[in-house]
């Protein structure tokens, strides 16, 4: 079992002036000088900071079951004790095969397995839906127009990694919420170079997570109950640099909705943000939305 | 659209020493880092190391320590490398560039700055 | 440090004919390798980010892969235009070393 013993405090004093800088500085990637403020976990704080056990940082890359750390708030062990043994990442025989058709309306069994991303949902029209609670939202390093070219391999992809099913948020209009991100000029720059078209350099994603199938599976007790513990899990591979994910993310975090509405288009939209969004026709900046925090 | 511009040619003497510049427009200076590259005749990329216009802070290659000294201007968007005690062997053509956020894949080059040293 | 080898060195290609070049890290680096073409007298341009990612205006017969420690460049039908020196990076942890660079020439 992983030992309880406080982490040391941050060994390197030229770490703190590197916190947040943008860069994710290999000497101060560790919990004591909080994985180089974020640089090194896509803004993610601490990903073990619910984990009571305060070794399982280190355990978690070690392809071996910590059965201390295998719990929600441990981040499932990165999943070593799941599945037996049996193969983590989907066949790469099938893996193009089911990200081009993942979420195309036609059942693909050989890509209906979690790790290979349950075919988008594709398999389980007649099984109710299973949110989650709150929304995923990834800023990711390119723009809307080239991430929805190739949304299917980008939701396939993120639902392999996080073994459960993920989809975008729709709007109102049942428009997937992916919206511009451009970092503005600072407020001090003179008025007419913050005039400049500020650049597009990403996108703001918001999806959800739909847990339908990963619940139902036989060894049911690894599936993220809420969008905030799946993010503590994207920024815990970054941090170990285990993210296989083609897709260049600056940053990951969950935030918490509204219950949806069921009357509106898309099933598992509207509600809180969505009246926002409509209002402003918002395009993020650095920083990401506004946080709208709802009490369950 | 985003440009960067260096300084022209130099040509020093063995044990002087060099400052090149380069001046950014099209974008907010103080959000992205500046990197600055050689590249010696017929060789490849050298990264030397980089600034934050924003905070002053700055990483270098372990080779280039105590020979390039990065500052920047903030008021006229502009990077600076100094290079001292200079020797044949820092004969090259030197980059700025625009690392991108987080990842620092370099999209906006500089034209070069080529310095020879000799006697 | 990590070190980035590029192989081959150099390679002659006839026009149409499909090209690999290869980036091998001496440790695993992810997604984190980028691709550069420099031709005589220019600055570097990117081809590549994020090992696969063409970036704007690159034409799509430019093809990266690979994940952890090898890495493919591939041209799927040679052009004139694309005879240059190719060389890989290494992304998000410094140094970010460049490899040593594969010499594309026109048969």
């Known amino acids: 079992a992983p030992e309880v013993s406080e982490e040391p405090r941050c060994p390197r004093a030229a770490c703190q002036a590197k916190r947040g800088d943008q860069r994710c500085d290999r000497e101060c990637n560790s919990p004591g000088c909080g994985w180089d403020g974020g640089d090194c976990s896509l803004s993610v704080g601490d990903p073990w900071r619910q984990c009571e056990a305060l070794q399982c940082w280190r355990l978690f890359n070690n392809s071996r079951c910590d059965p201390a750390c295998s719990s929600p708030a441990c981040l499932y062990d990165n999943f070593d004790c799941h599945a037996g043994g049996r193969e983590r990442t989907c066949n790469p025989v099938y893996e193009k095969y089911c990200a081009d058709h993942f979420a195309d309306g036609r059942c693909d069994q050989g890509c209906n397995t979690e790790e290979c991303g349950w075919d988008g949902l594709d398999c389980a029209s007649e099984v109710p839906a299973l949110l989650a609670r709150g929304v995923l939202v990834l800023t990711v390093l390119l723009p809307p127009e080239e991430l929805l070219r190739s949304s299917a391999d980008f939701l396939q992809r993120l639902s392999a990694i996080l073994r459960t099913s993920l989809r975008f948020r729709l709007d109102a209009h049942g428009q997937a919420m992916v919206f511009p991100y451009h970092r503005p000029s600072p407020g001090s720059e003179p008025r007419a170079r913050r005039e400049l078209a500020p650049e597009v350099i990403g996108s703001v994603v918001m999806l959800e997570i739909d847990n339908r199938l990963c619940l139902q599976s036989p060894e049911n007790d690894h599936c993220f109950p809420d969008a905030q513990s799946a993010a503590d899990y994207l920024g815990a591979l970054s941090a170990v640099e285990r993210l296989d994910f083609p897709y260049p993310l600056r940053d990951v975090r969950g935030e918490p909705l509204e219950p949806p509405e069921p009357s509106v288009p898309g099933g598992g939209s509207g509600g809180g943000l969505n009246d926002i969004f409509e209002a402003q026709k918002i395009e993020w900046h650095e920083g990401g939305p506004p946080h709208h925090h709802h009490h369950h | 659209q985003v440009k960067l511009l260096q300084s022209g040619a130099a040509l020093v003497k063995p044990g002087a020493s060099v400052k090149m510049s380069c001046k950014a427009s099209?974008?907010?200076?103080?959000?992205?880092?500046v990197t600055w590259v050689k590249q010696s005749h017929g060789k490849s990329l050298e990264w030397i190391g980089e600034?934050?216009?924003?905070?002053?802070?700055?990483n270098f290659n372990e080779k280039f320590k105590g020979k390039a000294t990065l500052t920047v201007d903030k008021s006229t968007s502009t990077a600076y490398m100094e290079l001292s005690r200079l020797t044949s062997e820092d004969s090259a053509i030197y980059y700025c560039t625009r690392g991108e956020i987080r990842y620092n894949w370099f999209a906006y080059w500089g034209q070069g700055t080529l310095v020879t040293v000799s006697s | 440090n990590i070190v980035m080898t590029q192989s081959p060195k150099s390679m002659s290609i006839s026009v149409g004919d499909r090209v690999t070049m290869n980036c091998k890290a001496s440790?695993?680096?992810?997604?984190?390798i980028a691709w550069y073409q420099q031709k005589p007298g220019q600055s570097p341009k990117l081809l590549i980010y994020?090992?696969?990612n063409r970036y704007t205006g690159v034409p799509d017969r430019f093809t990266g892969g690979g994940y952890g420690t090898d890495f493919t460049l591939t041209i799927n039908s040679m052009q004139a235009e694309d005879a240059a020196f190719y060389y890989c990076q290494r992304l998000y942890n410094s140094p970010f070393t460049f490899g040593s660079g594969t010499k594309l020439e026109i048969k």
């Open positions: 440790q695993n680096v992810g997604n984190n």
């Open positions: 994020y090992a696969s």
């Open positions: 600034i934050s216009p924003n905070s002053g802070g700055t």
């Open positions: 099209g974008y907010a200076f103080t959000d992205y880092w």
